[in-house]
Interface confidence: medium
């Protein structure tokens, strides 16, 4: 093949090599950019900055090499448009630092930074951690900080991500209340902070106030939908990002629904209970307290992470006609109590038959392993029985 006279020449089916001395000062308008998976750049002393716009359109890029060039600065968002990047070689440039944000969101298998005049500071704490944890092939490079010694020896005691404290009301919050949350941010070199409110939707009217180091958030006219929703405060410095999520508990009364009994592995009387705080439950059978046993017991389904309602069953193991009757579920929390009742018929009474009818006879083997006995009542110092707490 004839030698390529251009600044950048094709290499393989989807690669590009730019090695002609001093031919590039930016990566704009590279030929065939949208299909490139590999880009190799060398000897480009005028290529000093790598920014977001430089790699726009390189969505398929897997390998990027910029070596023996004049690269001084890589923007924190430089690789936003190259999410598939897995190998990044920036060796033998003029880089003094590289932000943790630059590699955030990438799944880099290899990161090469040797031969750069790195300056040891907290901004490289993330890289030191990669070295400690054996990530991206960093340990093998034995990275040095210019005039300061090995990166591995950099003191890091003061290199922490921001510390966040979110103040939430400890008293109950009622539907319709306004709630003030405050996020206190501490730490060195604070850069940005804010709230993530994606889960809130119509749960409240949101008003943000203040800025670093104290961010305010007013949730006005809250609804019960706010329960179990994350409100997240975040902050960033040159070391990294910190997030703290809190939930605001909006109190509302207990409610309960009962549904027709269904036969599954056992019989099940399905129920749904709601309320904040999570209600206590109690079952009645024909108006009297139903003491749960291994044959009749409450069972909950796995709760959804983002809602307060709980679903479950009163499980009945092989119920007979003596279990036929009226089942009532009581639910109580400090803001109200609720009940629901349902009639359940599991089996006809075999002793109620017309004398004219033939008498049914059945034979069953003797169960030699059966045991019988009353449920054991556990005593304690309270004068009360036990009811189920949901939550």
């Amino acid at each position: 093949a004839a030698p390529c006279p251009d600044a950048c020449c094709p290499h393989g089916s989807s690669g590009l090599r730019c090695t002609r001395d001093g031919a590039l000062d930016s990566l704009h308008h590279l030929p065939g950019a949208e299909n490139l998976t590999e880009l190799y750049i060398e000897n480009q002393q005028h290529l000093q900055h790598l920014e977001l716009r430089d790699l726009r359109g390189l969505g398929e890029l897997r390998n990027l090499t910029i070596v023996k060039s004049g690269l001084r600065f890589v923007a924190p968002d430089a690789f936003h448009f190259t999410p598939r990047l897995s190998r990044l070689n920036l060796s033998f440039n003029a880089l003094e630092s590289l932000s943790w944000k630059t590699v955030q969101g990438l799944s880099l298998q290899e990161l090469v930074l040797s031969g750069n005049p790195l300056h040891c500071s907290c901004a490289l704490r993330w890289l030191q951690r990669w070295e400690e944890e054996g990530l991206g092939g960093v340990p093998e490079q034995k990275l040095q900080c210019h005039g300061q010694g090995p990166l591995a020896h950099m003191p890091n005691a003061s290199c922490g991500v921001p510390t966040l404290k979110v103040q939430v009301p400890n008293a109950s919050v009622d539907v319709g209340d306004d709630v003030l949350l405050r996020c206190q941010v501490e730490g060195r070199g604070l850069e940005q902070a804010g709230w993530i409110l994606t889960e809130l939707e119509q749960s409240a009217t949101v008003m943000k106030s203040g800025g670093l180091p104290s961010l305010g958030l007013t949730l006005a006219n809250v609804t019960s939908d706010l329960n179990r929703k994350n409100v997240t405060c975040w902050a960033e410095n040159d070391v990294g990002r910190a997030e703290v999520s809190v939930q605001v508990n909006v109190s509302f009364p207990a409610s309960v629904q009962l549904h027709t009994a269904v036969e599954m592995h056992h019989w099940c009387i399905p129920f749904s209970v709601d309320g904040q705080p999570a209600p206590s439950l109690r079952w009645l059978f024909n108006g009297s307290v139903l003491n749960e046993t291994s044959f009749i017991f409450t069972e909950f389904l796995e709760p959804a992470a983002n809602e307060t309602v709980r679903h479950g069953c009163l499980r009945l193991n092989q119920p007979t006609h003596v279990n036929n009757g009226n089942y009532t579920l009581l639910a109580a929390n400090p803001f109200g109590q609720a009940s629901a009742s349902i009639m359940a018929a599991f089996m006809d009474n075999p002793f109620e038959f017309n004398p004219e009818d033939p008498i049914p006879v059945s034979f069953s083997p003797v169960d030699t392993n059966s045991t019988s006995g009353d449920p054991v009542e556990k005593k304690d110092e309270t004068p009360f029985g036990v009811s189920v707490a949901v939550g």
Epitope: S251, P253, P277, S280, R282, L330, G336, T382, F384, S387
Partner: antibody, heavy 123, light 106 residues
Framework: EVKLLESGGGLVQPGGSLRLSCAAS????????MSWVRQTPGKRLEWVAY????????YYPDTVKGRFTISRDNSKNTLYLQMNSLRAEDTAVYYC????????????????WGQGTTVTVSS | EIVLTQSPATLSLSPGERATLSCSAS?????MHWYQQKPGQAPRLLIY???NLASGIPARFSGSGSGTDFTLTISSLEPEDFAVYYC?????????FGQGTKLEIK
Amino acid sequence: EVKLLESGGGLVQPGGSLRLSCAASGFTFSTYTMSWVRQTPGKRLEWVAYISKGGGSTYYPDTVKGRFTISRDNSKNTLYLQMNSLRAEDTAVYYCARGAMYGNDFFYPMDYWGQGTTVTVSS
Amino acid sequence: EIVLTQSPATLSLSPGERATLSCSASSSVSYMHWYQQKPGQAPRLLIYTTSNLASGIPARFSGSGSGTDFTLTISSLEPEDFAVYYCHQWSSYPWTFGQGTKLEIK
């Protein structure tokens, strides 16, 4: 034997603050909810504050919400009531009372009460 | 809030007689609880969840009722039963007490 001993009451001017304490013994404090109830000079009982067994949930009636704060230190078996912006109508005997075991069992009331501590708000 | 009204305000009876104390709620409640208070003492739990006897309470005390009307009955009064009795609901927030019924010796 279950014992609840309140302290910290006294005479305070309107707008002032007081902190009541309740030392608990004879039961596993951290497994019970706790409340404060007051009795006015006219002998009416009024529930004032509630706290869950771990201290994460607190409830107050509107008459004291925003002024009173209930808290607990399970390592010291002690319940507290911080009372700010006190008013003449807060004058009462304040009782601490033990609530239900097994977390928040909302069917059951307060079963044991202390002997009370007197708070007088007057100028 | 749910208002609890106790009647009568004062009940004068003799030892051995039957005492019936009433408590009426302004809205329906699931349960009622009853306390006894003697002069200079803290309230003492008598009846919980409408009809259950608290620990150490004699069987002459009983409770009944549902919805808005509840009753505390003392079947045969003993001298130590003369005191003030309070009903209490914790079915609806805020939790409230009745104003009390004073049971005195006739």
